[in-house]
Amino acid sequence: VTEERSAPSAQPVYTPSRDKPKAHLTIMRQTPVPHLKNELAALHWENNLGMAFTKNRMNYTNKFLVIPESGDYFIYSQITFRGTTSECGDISRVRRPKKPDSITVVITKVADSYPEPAHLLTGTKSVCEISSNWFQPIYLGAMFSLEEGDRLMVNVSDISLVDYTKEDKTFFGAFLI
Amino acid sequence: VTEERSAPSAQPVYTPSRDKPKAHLTIMRQTPVPHLKNELAALHWENNLGMAFTKNRMNYTNKFLVIPESGDYFIYSQITFRGTTSECGDISRVRRPKKPDSITVVITKVADSYPEPAHLLTGTKSVCEISSNWFQPIYLGAMFSLEEGDRLMVNVSDISLVDYTKEDKTFFGAFLI
Amino acid sequence: VTEERSAPSAQPVYTPSRDKPKAHLTIMRQTPVPHLKNELAALHWENNLGMAFTKNRMNYTNKFLVIPESGDYFIYSQITFRGTTSECGDISRVRRPKKPDSITVVITKVADSYPEPAHLLTGTKSVCEISSNWFQPIYLGAMFSLEEGDRLMVNVSDISLVDYTKEDKTFFGAFLI
């Protein structure tokens, strides 16, 4: 009987699905911001127009998704990149190939309890294209145990190569499982 | 007391996980069927053989997954494409590269409340292959707020380049979070 | 009142989200193990260091994630591959291209009730790179109905091409929906 009666009062521990923190953010035009060489640039996001939303205390602020409740979250992002012929595709250099250009996406966690940002997910791809204009997505998604107050951001190797034209091509989201 | 008694009728608001609408559809051989010019072709799917299933009022009909209950859904698809050497890979043309071939997947939402189909997710990739036979997947997945009656489909740029041979290579699914 | 009392007894059927089996495994250095030619090699994983964890009776043993409870699971993996120039990218051979090298990931289910392993998910990509060092991920994720005791593993076409340097580049996970 005790168990039966105490279950409902424990309900807050088991947040119903409809009340779970969740967000789907979509790309917006980036303002070029100087950042340190060899440091990945953080993207900023649309959080309430079109397909974008934040719900149930999941908050977006200053490039970060802020986790409102400890638990296991599924986090995902797709970044579509686009560019012109990469240097390593120069046919005159094929016999002496150089280090290829590359595109990289990192989903990073910043925690107050830990000074160093943690790389949760990385997608990285060499790009060696001989066509005039190339384009391709990198998709990432996985589950992580997060703490209340943890902040998530998406970093890319070259902000100028990100396709920010459409919300369905470049996006970032998370939900409590 | 009123609230307690009305809860069961409101049960759809907090659907238990096991009762949540969900589907995993797998590829089946397409019959070449003409569709409007410049319009992406919609794929049709297996919904109850092998790994494929629909559950809890999630319904598959005529290329569409039909959403039975409003809520936030995780939607995903992988399409494996394959083909032969693409023209832009022709080594004699490298100095004057042409527009590359490309492969595109779009997960589209059709809503009775809105006349225009909405692109939820797009994966698009230039293809410039100098090898004999090329093959590669495009994966998409994200969360969207959907309404009862919304219909989801998967469209591709070229139906003749899709790998239809195996259910584990080309698939489409959704579940209420 | 009736509802409050009956809910807990139904609780086992609808496992609360916090009690659901789940795991996120990360790559570790592989010991080269001989396996049959043309047979995919199974990866082994880190299950409790860094970002890796198993929870709520989800168990990792001997390259397998063991499913503790029947239900619908979302299963995902990313494998980052890396290598040097693939043979078909040899510029002198462009006019007579050979079969391209390829990279393949398969998430496989082994069930006691069925002797043959089942391929749940396959990601396969031709690799024909003219750059000196190439690298790229294959991502997979989908939902499957699994039975208690089912075992999941990740197989790859060439274990020597897997990037095992970072837990955020190569990983494998599953959670009960």
């Epitope: - | 089946m28 051989r29 397409q30 019959t31 070449p32 069927v33 003409p34 569709h35 072709a41 092998g50 394959r82 083909g83 032969t84 023209e87 036979n133 070229d158 139906i159 003749s160 380049l161 899709v162 790998d163 239809y164 041979t165 195996k166 | -």
Partner: antibody, heavy 117, light 108 residues
Framework: QVQLQQWGAGLLKPSETLSLTCAVS????????WTWIRQPPGKGLEWIGE???????NYNPSLKSRVTISVDTSMSQFSLKMTSVTAADSAVYYC???????????WGQGTLVTVSS | EIELTQSPGTLSLSPGEGATLSCRAS???????LAWYQQKPGQAPRLLIY???RRATGIPDRFSGSGSGTDFTLTISRLEPGDFAVYFC?????????FGGGTKVEIK
């Protein structure tokens, strides 16, 4: 190198059943659809039907009622049966690999089937 | 079903010359899903072109395809001795798949 080797009876009487088999070597069997096509002497080609490694079939509607295509994945073989043949079914029958889709990049050597009383 | 008509029936040319073969469909071929094959006497057909203009693996670049809608063309820029054969077109934009009657390219 992919090779398709086919065999079966070449001479049939009207109303009999045509039976041909095609064995695939030198490549993956499960990654493709496999097709039968025929060519009457001096004429064009006609698509008969196709099968996947898992046994999924599609047939030309004009022949569907008389045709069965089957597969033996363990042997990397697929077969064609056509019932109630007539002289109009006399042709060279080819097996072929479908790649990328609905076009045929590797072919068997062909089997001449003659239907005559 | 879509009927494909090839013309001319026979084309008499010399090695080194260019050849233009026509394939006309009874209705529009969806997405230019048209292929070309070469067949030599006693041999199986060989895939040359698919998607109206995509060359199949190992096909030399003197073979090119073009066209859309109902009218398609196979062009051989410089005929070599091994190119004298029968050429068939095939549409796969509508079910069932259908083939043309063929054009014979012979040595003049």
């Amino acid at each position: 190198q992919v090779q398709l080797q086919q065999w079966g009876a070449g001479l049939l009487k009207p109303s009999e059943t045509l039976s041909l088999t095609c064995a695939v070597s030198g490549g993956s069997f499960s990654d493709y659809f496999w097709t039968w096509i025929r060519q009457p002497p001096g004429k064009g080609l006609e698509w008969i039907g196709e099968i996947s490694h898992s046994g999924r079939t599609n047939y030309n509607p004009s022949l569907k009622s008389r045709v069965t295509i089957s597969v033996d994945t363990s042997m990397s073989q697929f077969s064609l049966k056509m019932t109630s043949v007539t002289a109009a079914d006399s042709a060279v029958y080819y097996c072929a690999r479908d790649y990328p889709n609905w076009v045929f990049d590797y072919w068997g050597q062909g089997t001449l089937v003659t239907v005559s009383s | 079903e879509i009927e494909l008509t090839q013309s001319p029936g026979t084309l008499s040319l010399s090695p080194g010359e260019g050849a233009t073969l026509s394939c006309r469909a009874s209705q529009s071929v969806f997405n230019s899903y048209l292929a070309w094959y070469q067949q030599k006497p006693g041999q199986a057909p060989r895939l040359l072109i698919y998607g109206a203009s995509r060359r199949a693996t190992g096909i030399p670049d003197r073979f090119s395809g073009s066209g859309s809608g109902t009218d398609f063309t196979l062009t051989i820029s410089r005929l070599e001795p091994g190119d004298f054969a029968v050429y068939f077109c095939q549409q796969y934009g509508n079910s069932p798949l259908t083939f043309g009657g063929g054009t014979k390219v012979e040595i003049k």
